[in-house]
Amino acid sequence: GDLLIQKTIKKQVVLEEGTIAFKNWVKTGTEVYRQFWIFDVQNPQEVMMNSSNIQVKQRGPYTYRVRFLAKENVTQDAEDNTVSFLQPNGAIFEPSLSVGTEADNFTVLNLAVAAASHIYQNQFVQMILNSLINKSKSSMFQVRTLRELLWGYRDPFLSLVPYPVTTTVGLFYPYNNTADGVYKVFNGKDNISKVAIIDTYKGKRNLSYWESHCDMINGTDAASFPPFVEKSQVLQFFSSDICRSIYAVFESDVNLKGIPVYRFVLPSKAFASPVENPDNYCFCTEKIISKNCTSYGVLDISKCKEGRPVYISLPHFLYASPDVSEPIDGLNPNEEEHRTYLDIEPITGFTLQFAKRLQVNLLVKPSEKIQVLKNLKRNYIVPILWLNETGTIGDEKANMFRSQVTGKIN
């Protein structure tokens, strides 16, 4: 009966050698793809000279296979019933799933110019930077290949900086041959309701990026949740990509390859301003760009990115306040394409299908002392790209799941 199934499930979702969960956890059996759409700037000169609205045109998808590498340094700790690991990063370009090649060119914001002018606000340093920007023939915008933009390029302006700085720039640099973690998660041996919940990340229970409860590392990594998921639950998870914990709420019942799953979505409330959602007060880190914490839908993660003015949002500024998207033309947000969801099999708590969508933006501000930013009359949160990371349980795995889990219950 149900008790026997519960007992079997509890046993099989423990993260230790020999369980179904462990095997799929160490190396995901699902093919995970990350699609990129790049925002190609159509009017760079007008923006730089007249502070016009930025006209963007998205180009994509450019698809990479990701998360194909097994977890590394997997170490069980019997004393506190945890397992620690590193999640290695790797990306393989998939030409057949892409609209072009990694050599395709895009006009995008000059990442180094925007970042350096933000990090070094001292006017004298900005004047030094200005002379180097001019000397390197850099500008507010640049033309870069997809490969350069994502994985890194040697910046000509930063290469002239006479004190030690990283001269290689890229939105995901460094990526290949790096790893995320160390994660230490509960293995569920002593308490199945804690399975996969993160105990520490990089040796800490807090991130040191935010104030108060915003700084907490909550829940799992979203690949799985403790078993016996209820529709009424708020599922907490931590995403290192956005440097914060976030949550998902039940939206609908979905049938995935014959398996009944619960679709959990990231609600607009999670992106709301503290005016609408007081819990979000500690995600508002400054008063000027956020218009005294009234703007919403963008997250300033500069503290997590060595001071670089990176802002995370949903694609096309979905769920963002009008003032954020007002200076950008060419955006068309819609929930179906641009929201994040998790399809969770409720008995095991496994995420059998997901679509993680986010947009990477960079803040650029007027600068009195930097010529190429001198004519700007306002701040811009400039969209660089958005991504859609998806994974769906394979047919073979789905059959196995149906026969071993859902079939037995029904």
Partner: antibody, heavy 118, light 107 residues
Framework: EVQLQQSGPELVKPGASVKISCETS????????MHWVKQSHGKSLEWIGG????????KYNQKFKGKATLTVDKSSSTAYMELRSLTSEDSAVYYC???????????WGQGTLVTVSA | ETTVTQSPASLSMAIGEKVTIRCITS??????MNWYQQKPGEPPKLLIS???TLRPGVPSRFSSSGYGTDFIFTIENMLSEDVADYYC?????????FGAGTKLELK
């Protein structure tokens, strides 16, 4: 109160070097640029260069490249300027001056008189 | 390098008179001009910073105007304590450059 205290007058021989100090107090030393300015007797002011203590970024007036070297000691909140291969042309009062946010040369030291004479 | 041409080199004015000093730059510097006063045996003192901004504590008889390449510094009603050398400084680009100075004397 922000104060810039410079070292005393120097009498040096041609060809020698001299190192002038500018000790600061009353502010966060690393956050503000320290500049050095030359004033020859009865003449105008000339910007020698500046240093941002936070990251050591320096910029020199081309005219003083090879003549002046700017350094800082963060632990003692002191800025230094070394002048080398001195000639009579280098005889002048040298000032250190500090910025305040977006204001140039908001605070000045009292000046150091350097006399180059055989 | 932006050169700054300051005029006149010297000026002799009576108390209560209006004093005008001019600086012309070789390049367009927007409003990035600063004005300093120096009394004998003292370091210069900042009176007016970029954007024609009068510094706190500086009497309102001092003012400046100008944009681009042409800048004017004015003392509305000269007092005896205003006897000093006056310098303009462009801070639009490096190297920072000063005008040659104006010696203001009492008539």
């Amino acid at each position: 109160e922000v104060q810039l205290q410079q070292s005393g007058p120097e009498l040096v021989k041609p060809g020698a070097s001299v190192k002038i100090s500018c000790e600061t107090s009353g502010h966060t030393f690393t956050e503000y640029t320290m500049h050095w300015v030359k004033q020859s007797h009865g003449k105008s002011l000339e910007w020698i260069g500046g240093i941002y203590p936070n990251n050591g970024a320096t910029k020199y007036n081309q005219k003083f490249k090879g003549k002046a070297t700017l350094t800082v000691d963060k632990s003692s909140s002191t800025a230094y300027m070394e002048l080398r291969s001195l000639t009579s042309e280098d005889s002048a009062v040298y000032y250190c001056a500090r910025d305040r946010y977006d204001v140039w040369f908001a605070y000045w030291g009292q000046g150091t008189l350097v006399t180059v004479s055989a | 390098e932006t050169t700054v041409t300051q005029s006149p080199a010297s000026l002799s004015m009576a108390i209560g008179e209006k004093v005008t000093i001019r600086c012309i730059t070789s390049t367009d510097i927007d409003d990035d001009m600063n004005w300093y006063q120096q009394k004998p045996g003292e370091p210069p003192k900042l009176l007016i910073s970029e954007g024609n901004t009068l510094r706190p504590g500086v009497p309102s008889r001092f003012s400046s105007s100008g944009y681009g390449t042409d800048f004017i510094f004015t003392i509305e009603n000269m007092l005896s304590e205003d006897v000093a050398d006056y310098y303009c400084l462009q801070s639009d680009n490096l190297p920072l450059t000063f005008g040659a100075g104006t010696k203001l004397e009492l008539k």
